[in-house]
């Protein structure tokens, strides 16, 4: 009884088509497959950045695999063939593993690459990103900013730079068009008289960088005699209202402050007969809904009613 | 196996120059960076340069007017080159490979004594 | 230039003693960028600890190293006799690169 036996694949490496952080894992098959040509092979395959605790796995029939990865750090991969227990009559079998690994090497100190990297899609419109200048480079150092993600052919720099003092310190960029929800690959790398610049990588996706703009035409209503009806309208943009969470401020005789967090344009606020002055102010951010995370608008324009019968009068900004 | 190798001349007259080489094998110089290190008798280790992958170069500041460090990738070979030597520059003199920003792999190292 | 000082210069522990040694560095380093290498008379040093907290290949599990900012510290948990040695500690954050003096680790 002959123990089945199954080689690891071929030729198993990372390939980097330039897009700043999404490689190309492939492989061929094995030698000697032809005793399991009825069968189909499948392989395991695991892979990390290096420095990682935990490995990526995934089993597919393929011979190649796609991801993004952060180019900052190295990347190891190991895969192997997998024949299953209907090939071999009784127990699945396994090759040993084929391993690879992937850097982009270095060239700088690390304290020469951007310092405090700030990217922010405004409005889910209008992405802007900054950075400052690494420490101890000259002013001879200059910073170019690359980006990529799917559905651009190739990676693409920055046409329209945020300068001070000659140097580039941020990228305001064109239209992107259908790059919400992907992983959108920056490189920020540099060129000195000097000396070497580091790279830097970043990997996010637009929809958890998104600061609307604040809610406007901010009212009130008197919904009875204990209770005012706070309301405001979603600014202008393409952000749908289901996708806004609120923060209200209200301020009562200047004393009592309350906050609180609401999902709708609408709160209904408690008060009495007594309260003489009203102001609110109100702030928006994308909800859980529509992204994992989010940047507060700015607080919007501050509505106030003083001094009168609010069920005479509706105030509108 | 990763290897690399200092060779030197060992003894150098007060004000004359200096080549060490570094020789590695069982990795390519064009994937890895080699930093140049040296340690004075019984006393802290020291930082000189380091030669890129793709060839710039970064020097400590103190010593720059006096290092240059120069490679032949298909020779596998790095060169530390110092000149106008003092009594001070005796050390033993380390090449290591640069591997995610730390020294993954040291050389043996090669002494220096600077004397007349 | 970022100075590393660490102490103490010269220590000894008994087999089985837990040791501890710290550097403190003059600015804050990046934990990512802050190792440790352990060095024996007439040997090259040897990475020992990377990026603060990471065993180098062959490092027993007893050493471990933690800290941030400016702080930053290598531990034994049980002293062994191959455990004598220098240890430095090396800042690769901003140029020029530096070490630290060394703590010398003697048996006890």
């Known amino acids: 009884d002959t123990e089945i036996k199954v080689n690891p694949p071929q030729d198993f490496e990372i390939v980097d088509p330039g897009y700043l952080g999404y490689l190309y894992l492939q492989w061929q098959p094995p030698l000697s497959l032809d005793h399991f040509k009825e069968c189909t092979v499948e392989y395991e395959l695991k892979y990390r950045n290096i420095g990682s605790e935990t490995w990526k796995t995934i089993i597919t029939k393929n011979l190649h695999y796609k991801d993004g990865f952060d180019l900052n750090k190295g990347i190891e991969a190991k895969i192997h063939t997998l024949l299953p227990w209907q090939c071999t009559n009784g127990s699945e079998v396994q090759s040993s593993w084929a391993e690879t690994t992937y850097w982009i090497s270095p060239q700088g100190i690390p304290e020469t690459k951007v310092q405090d990297m700030d990217c922010v899609y405004y409005n889910w419109q209008y992405l802007l990103c900054s950075w400052k200048p690494g420490i101890g480079v000259l002013l001879d150092t200059n910073y170019n900013l690359f980006y990529w993600y799917e559905g651009l052919d190739h990676a693409l720099q920055c046409v329209d730079y945020i300068k001070a003092d000659g140097q580039n310190i941020g990228c305001r960029f064109p239209y992107l068009e259908a790059s919400d929800y992907k992983d959108f690959y920056i490189c920020v790398n540099g060129s000195s008289e000097n000396k070497p610049i580091r790279s830097s990588y970043f990997t996010f996706q637009l929809q958890n960088i998104v600061k609307p703009l604040p809610p406007v035409y901010l009212t009130f209503t008197r919904e009875s005699s204990c209770e005012i009806k706070l309301k405001w309208s979603i600014p202008l943009g393409p952000i749908p209202a289901r996708c806004f969470d609120y923060e209200i401020e209200i301020r009562e005789d200047d004393t009592t402050l309350v906050t609180a967090t609401v999902e709708n344009e609408t709160y209904t606020l408690k008060t009495t007969n007594e309260t003489r002055q009203l102001c609110f102010v109100v702030r928006s951010k994308v909800n859980i809904y529509c992204s994992d995370d989010g940047i507060w608008s700015e607080w919007s324009d501050k509505q106030c009613w003083e001094g009168e019968d609010l069920s005479k009068k509706t105030l509108l900004r | 196996e990763v290897k690399l190798e200092e060779s030197g001349p060992g003894l150098v007259a007060p004000s004359q120059s200096l080549s060490i080489a570094c020789t590695v094998s069982g990795f390519s110089l064009t994937r890895h960076g080699i930093h140049w290190v040296r340690q004075p008798p019984g006393k802290n280790l020291e930082w000189l340069g380091v030669i890129w992958a793709g060839g710039s170069t970064n020097y400590n500041s103190a010593l720059m007017s006096r290092l240059s460090i120069i490679k032949d990738n298909s020779k596998s070979q790095v060169f530390l080159k110092m000149n106008s030597l003092q009594t001070v520059d005796t050390a033993m003199y380390y090449c290591?490979?640069?591997?995610?920003?730390?020294?993954?792999?040291w050389g043996q190292g090669t002494t220096l004594t600077v004397s007349s | 230039d970022i100075v590393l000082t660490q102490t103490p210069a010269i220590m000894s522990a008994s087999l089985g003693e837990r040791v501890t040694m710290t550097c403190t560095a003059s600015s804050s380093v990046s934990s990512s960028y802050l190792h440790w290498y352990q060095q024996k008379p007439g040997s090259s040093p040897k990475l020992w600890i990377y990026s603060t907290s990471n065993l180098a290949s062959g490092v027993p599990l007893r050493f471990s190293g933690s800290g941030s900012g400016t702080s930053y510290s290598l531990t034994i948990s049980s002293m062994e006799a191959e455990d004598a040695a220098t240890y430095y500690c090396?800042?690769?954050?901003?140029?020029?690169?530096?070490f630290g003096a060394g703590t010398k680790l003697e048996l006890k």
């Open positions: 090396h800042q690769y954050h901003r140029s020029p690169l530096t």
């Open positions: 290591a490979r640069d591997h995610f920003d730390s020294f993954d792999y």
